[in-house]
């Protein structure tokens, strides 16, 4: 049976076998081809969501679909069933909190009432002043908050305790990549994790633990990336992994928080990476134990530089590293998260790709995730 | 910098075939995407095939489809390219090109079909 | 398969002039646009990836615009060795496909 499962697909009607290999070559081998159905998926990047949250104290802006501006939403008359739309519509299934907050005097938005038309936020048509002169401040899951918090030093053992948003994902009972959990549903990671193996069978998360061999693993129900373009293969490396049954939170199991979608870090900016990767660059084995390290922000400008990335480092992307070289993500770290700590956790980048591992002018290069903060809202709103 | 040495020029018979070799240099031969395109002439570029070397999957042109084979080898950073059964229409300059940043192609190889 | 339309097919102009040469594509492509010149019996050379980053070693005359089917590859003051063919490519979907070239004549 392990065998036949390992080497083999069992087709019905009728039942009989191909060779593993035959899923998700794009070809119908089963009659019904079920053979092409559990397979990773593309969804395009989609039309912009029409709410967002600032980093301003996570408040809420609406979309004007008419006129293409962004409003801050008014806490007049806000409530519960508004804070829930606009949650939904970022495709979150959980029940949001929300306060008011006072306008700042860097406001430099328009603030309007907010209302609610066909389950979609909307500007209310004859909103005067802002009568509570307070903002709307919006969380839609509790997230990015750890046991304890990690002490600022080179490399060293992680704890779970630290960390409990990362996850191992596995092949085969084989870790091939890291990521991140964002909600009892969800996990974030690489869409390159993926190029090898786009079956969905065989793929596992396992999730609670530091260590890479202990933890039981967690089946998967959908593998879903952006368009896969061959000409820019290191293009859009984002993927998000639906569980088949939802986490239960605890100590170890809590998600991360996705990014502000004005999270704009600048150069120096201290961040943190995780994983159970090569040690040493063409180091042959993964750590055991899950490590983390301390990093920094490295300017765009810098890292694409004649004697760096040399313009292969989009906007889409960010560089992170140490300016002396010597700690960075390398093998077995990608998908993982790239953080960075304001009241919470965010996770701000994936680990995507890089020249060899810890070089001074090659730091690691992470997916932004705040640019694709759209296609995961998308994303989530057509599998709610 | 980048660099990309095609093989030599060749006469070819009809029916015959031509394998054209590319020796890359200068970045990670195996994460680039490398096209193939060939310009007869007086005309414009027209794209044959194409390889990631990391992943092992060519892409072919509908037109060359069963015609072409693209193929690279990783030890040595080389792309080939084999050309089919021929035809004195088949004349022409044959370029690998890298896509991307450091976009750079080979000086090209004269393919030269006649009987 | 996306078609690129590339227009003129053939301008004169003179050195110090501006040049603006477009690029439709027949569907999105997103910024996946490359600009290149070629001098009669040489391979062409990239000036522009993804629609508007410079190619290093590129003078800073040429720029790129554009996203989704309209392109524009403009030279802000013509070089006597900018006189060539110009050529755009998309690289959004395999095949990739060329414009059918500018030529840019002396006048």
């Known amino acids: 049976k392990v065998i036949l499962d390992k080497y083999y697909f069992l087709c019905g009607q009728p039942l009989h076998f191909i060779p593993r290999k035959q899923l998700c070559d794009g070809e119908l081998d089963c009659p019904l081809g079920e053979d092409e159905e559990h397979c990773v998926k593309s969804f395009p990047e989609g039309p912009a969501v029409a709410v967002r949250l600032s980093k301003d104290r996570s408040t809420l802006q609406v979309l004007d679909s008419a006129t293409g501006n962004w409003f801050s939403a008014c806490f007049d008359n806000f409530t519960e069933a508004l804070a829930e739309t606009a949650c939904r519509q970022m495709g979150y299934s959980s029940k949001p909190t929300f306060r008011a907050v006072e306008i700042g005097p860097d406001q430099d938005l328009d603030v309007v009432e907010i209302t609610e038309n066909s389950q979609e936020l909307r500007m209310r048509n004859s909103s005067g002043p802002c009568l509570s002169g307070s903002l709307v401040s919006l969380h839609c899951l509790a997230c990015g908050k750890s046991l304890k918090t990690p002490r600022v030093v080179g490399v060293e053992e992680a704890s779970v305790d630290s960390w409990p948003w990362q996850v191992s994902i596995q092949y085969d009972k084989q870790h091939v990549c890291g990521g991140s959990i964002l909600d009892p549903h969800w996990v974030l990671t690489a869409a390159h994790c993926f190029r090898k193996h786009t079956d969905v069978f065989n793929w596992k998360v396992r999730a609670g633990s530091d260590k890479l061999g202990s933890f039981p693993s967690l089946a998967v129900a959908k593998i879903i990336i952006i368009e896969f373009n061959p000409m820019y293969p290191k293009d859009n490396d984002i993927a998000l992994m639906k569980l088949q049954f939802p986490l239960t939170f605890s100590g170890t199991v809590r998600p991360i928080c996705l990014p502000f979608f004005d999270e704009e870090l600048t150069p120096a900016t201290p961040l943190w990476i995780i994983g159970w990767g090569f040690t040493k660059q063409n180091g042959g084995k993964m750590s055991d134990i899950l490590l983390q390290a301390s990093v920094q922000v490295i300017d765009s400008t810098r890292c694409n530089a004649d004697d760096a990335y040399q313009g292969e480092v989009t906007e889409k992307m960010m560089c992170a590293g140490i300016p002396e070289g010597g700690v960075d993500t390398c093998q077995g770290d990608s998908g993982g998260p790239l953080m960075y700590q304001s009241d919470q956790w965010h996770v701000v980048g994936i680990v995507s790709w890089g020249y060899g591992c810890g070089g001074p002018s090659t730091p690691g290069v992470y997916t932004k995730v705040s640019a694709y903060l759209n296609w995961i809202y998308n994303v989530w709103k057509a599998e709610l | 910098q980048v660099q990309l040495v095609q093989s030599g020029a060749e006469v070819k018979k009809p029916g015959s075939s031509v394998k054209v070799s590319c020796k890359a240099s200068g970045y990670t031969f195996t994460d680039y995407y490398m096209h193939w395109v060939r310009q007869a002439p007086g005309q414009g570029l027209e794209w044959m095939g194409g390889?990631?070397?990391?992943?092992?999957?060519?892409n072919y042109a509908q037109k060359f489809q069963g015609r072409v084979t693209i193929t690279a080898d990783e030890s040595t950073s080389t792309a080939y390219m084999e050309l089919s059964s021929l035809r004195s229409e088949d004349t022409a300059v044959y370029y690998c090109?890298?896509?991307?940043?450091?976009?750079?192609w080979g000086q090209g190889t004269l393919v030269t079909v006649s009987s | 398969d996306i078609q690129m339309t590339q227009s003129p097919s053939s301008l004169s102009a003179s050195v110090g002039d501006r040049v603006t040469i477009t690029c439709q594509a027949s569907q999105d492509i997103s910024n996946y646009l490359n600009w290149y010149q070629q001098k009669p019996g040489k391979a062409p050379k990239l000036l522009i990836y993804?629609?508007?980053s410079l190619e290093s070693g590129v003078p800073s005359r040429f720029s790129g615009s554009g996203s989704g089917t309209d392109f524009t590859l403009t030279i802000s003051s013509l070089q006597p060795e900018d006189f060539a063919t110009y050529y755009c490519q998309q690289s959004s979907r395999i095949p990739p496909t060329f414009g059918q070239g500018t030529k840019v004549e002396i006048k």
């Open positions: 090109a890298k896509e991307g940043a450091n976009g750079y």
């Open positions: 993804k629609a508007s």
């Open positions: 390889i990631i070397p990391i992943f092992g999957t060519a």
